[in-house]
Interface confidence: medium
C-alpha cells in the first residue's frame, strides 16, 4: 500500500537568463528510493539512481545541474522552459510516486522594463 506523499515547490516563476531549483520531497513512507527521474512533458531531463549516481540527458547537459540533494537546477532559462516538470520517485516496495511543478519563465523586468521604473 502506498502511504507516501510528494511535496513540491509547486508553481514557481523565474526570470529569463536566470536559474531555478526544482525540488521534490517524498515523505510519510519508509520505502527506499531507488531512483528519481526528472522529466519535462515526455522528455527525460535527468535521473538520480541510488546505486549508479546522476545522469543528465545529453540534450540538457549544458543547462541542467544535479542537486541540491535529489533536486535539479535549471540554468540559463528561456521562455521555452515554461511548462510542467515532473519528479518521478521509483521506490521499493511502494512503487512510483509523481510530483508536479509548473515553471513560468518571465522576461527580465530589468532588461525589458527597466527604463519605465527609473527615478527622474
Amino acid at each position: 500500500m502506498m502511504t507516501g506523499t510528494i511535496e513540491t515547490t509547486g508553481n514557481i516563476s523565474a526570470e529569463k537568463g536566470g536559474s531555478i531549483i526544482l525540488q521534490c520531497h517524498l515523505s510519510s513512507t519508509t520505502a527506499q528510493v531507488t531512483q528519481v527521474n526528472w522529466e519535462q512533458q515526455d522528455q527525460l531531463l535527468a535521473i538520480c539512481n541510488a546505486d549508479l549516481g546522476w545522469h543528465i540527458s545529453p540534450s540538457f547537459k549544458d543547462r541542467v545541474a544535479p542537486g541540491p540533494g535529489l533536486g535539479l537546477t535549471l540554468q540559463s532559462l528561456t521562455v521555452n522552459d515554461t511548462g510542467e516538470y515532473f519528479c518521478i520517485y521509483h521506490t521499493y516496495p511502494d512503487g512510483t510516486y509523481t510530483g508536479r511543478i509548473f515553471l513560468e519563465v518571465l522576461e527580465s523586468s530589468v532588461a525589458e522594463h527597466g527604463a519605465r521604473f527609473q527615478i527622474p
Epitope: 549508479l52 545522469h55 545529453p58 512510483t96
Partner: nanobody
C-alpha cells in the same frame, strides 16, 4: 507499443565470445534503462547487465559477469548489445532483453517489456 527482439545466441566453446543484440521496435520514450537477464535450466531468471538508454553513461553489471561482459546501446539503431567474452559453461542460459524503469539493487522493479530470449550454450 515497444517490442524487443534478441539475436546473436548460439553454441560457443569455453573461453569464446558472442555478441547479443536487442532490437527495439517502436519509440522508447519512458524507458530509462535497457537490461539483459538470463535463465539457466532449472534456475530463476537473474540480472546480467543494464545500460541507460539515453547517453549510455550509466552501466551496471552482475558480479558474476564483471570484467567479461560489456553492455552498450546505440540509440540511432534502437538496439542494445551485450558483448560476452571469456565465456564459461555456467554462462549457458536463455538470455532475455528487457526495458527497465530502474537499474541497481532492485533490478526486477519497474520492468514492463520482455523479449522472447536467445539461447547461449557454452560447451566444448
Amino acid at each position: 507499443e515497444v517490442q524487443l527482439v534478441e539475436s546473436g545466441g548460439g553454441l560457443v566453446q569455453p573461453g569464446g565470445s558472442l555478441r547479443l543484440s536487442c532490437a527495439a521496435s517502436g519509440t522508447i520514450t519512458s524507458a530509462v534503462f535497457m537490461g539483459w537477464f538470463r535463465q539457466a535450466p532449472g534456475k530463476e531468471r537473474e540480472f546480467v547487465a543494464a545500460v541507460i538508454w539515453r547517453g549510455g553513461s550509466l552501466k551496471s553489471y552482475a558480479d558474476s559477469v564483471k570484467g567479461r561482459f560489456t553492455i552498450s546501446a546505440d540509440n540511432s539503431k534502437n538496439t542494445a548489445y551485450l558483448q560476452m567474452n571469456s565465456l564459461k559453461p555456467e554462462d549457458t542460459a536463455v538470455y532475455y532483453c528487457a526495458k527497465l524503469a530502474v537499474a541497481g539493487n532492485y533490478y526486477y522493479y519497474g520492468m514492463d517489456v520482455w523479449g522472447q530470449g536467445t539461447l547461449v550454450t557454452v560447451s566444448s
